[in-house]
Amino acid sequence: TVPPMVNVTRSNASEGNITVTCRASSFYPRNIILTWRQDGVSLSHDTQQWGDVLPDGNGTYQTWVATRICRGEEQRFTCYMEHSGNHSTHPVPS
């Protein structure tokens, strides 16, 4: 088992909004849960976009999940990752 490296980034979207993206990379096996939480509970699936789980060329995998949020509300969101029985949560950078 190779645990993922998780990285959260933010980018400008429409005015007043930002897109936050949570990337998991360099993990094996390929089964992974990557999702956003808002106010400590699951963010509805229809407001999240997931990338495919793809090989990264080193025998490991990578994927991502993104959502659009209101600027100034970053503190309400965390990215949750679960892989091979281990899990972690990752805040949006300031």
């Epitope: 849960i33 400590g40 509970v41 699951s42 503190q75 309400r76 679960e82």
Partner: antibody
Framework: DVQLQGSGPGLVKPSQSLSLTCSVT???????YYWNWIRQFPGNKLEWM?????????NYNPSLKNRISITRDTSKNQFFLKLSSVTTEDTATYYC???DGRGAWFAYWAQGTLVTVSA | DIQMTQSPASLSASVGETVTITCRAS??????LAWYQQKQGKSPQLLVY???TLADGVPSRFSGSGSGTQYSLKINSLQPEDFGNYYC?????????FGAGTKVEIK
Amino acid sequence: DVQLQGSGPGLVKPSQSLSLTCSVTGYSITNDYYWNWIRQFPGNKLEWMGFISFGGSNNYNPSLKNRISITRDTSKNQFFLKLSSVTTEDTATYYCARYDGRGAWFAYWAQGTLVTVSA
Amino acid sequence: DIQMTQSPASLSASVGETVTITCRASGNIHNYLAWYQQKQGKSPQLLVYDAITLADGVPSRFSGSGSGTQYSLKINSLQPEDFGNYYCQHFWSFPLTFGAGTKVEIK
């Protein structure tokens, strides 16, 4: 370390409003986290009532309809529960509790405040 | 709303025994589950979150497991201080709801 302490009257008359205070020490309620009220009925059933967040937004249990209000006084680092039009069914032990944005589990609880609704 | 059904409602066990408490959600809660212990006259205390992770200071004889709609809390080698009420709680969505509780008594 953060501490929460609930307080308020132990007896409320039917049709009146129930008002409770949660005083927080060791952490500013505007910095982070979600500041909740939970009650436990006789017979031990637990019910989440709602929260006020670090930013001042609310989320309430729909079962309480329009009877509930959670507010705060940031200068005193306190948050409050107001439950209107109470009946004997609102007799319970009321807890204030905190969770953080990683997940809505309650790691910090105040001691309970028993509130009896009776004429 | 997601309903949480706990079983058994009560159980009697001896010190040193292993006990298992189960919690069933009315929908898939994807491991968004916490367990609490409550002693008589005290506030609930967090034991487990994210279905499997022990809270700080919780002894390793406690363990959480499960997925989907079915979850369990196991206590290996029950100790005298473990007697009390246990509750599950989901945090998949609002409103947050708790199970009705399991009372663990001394046999």
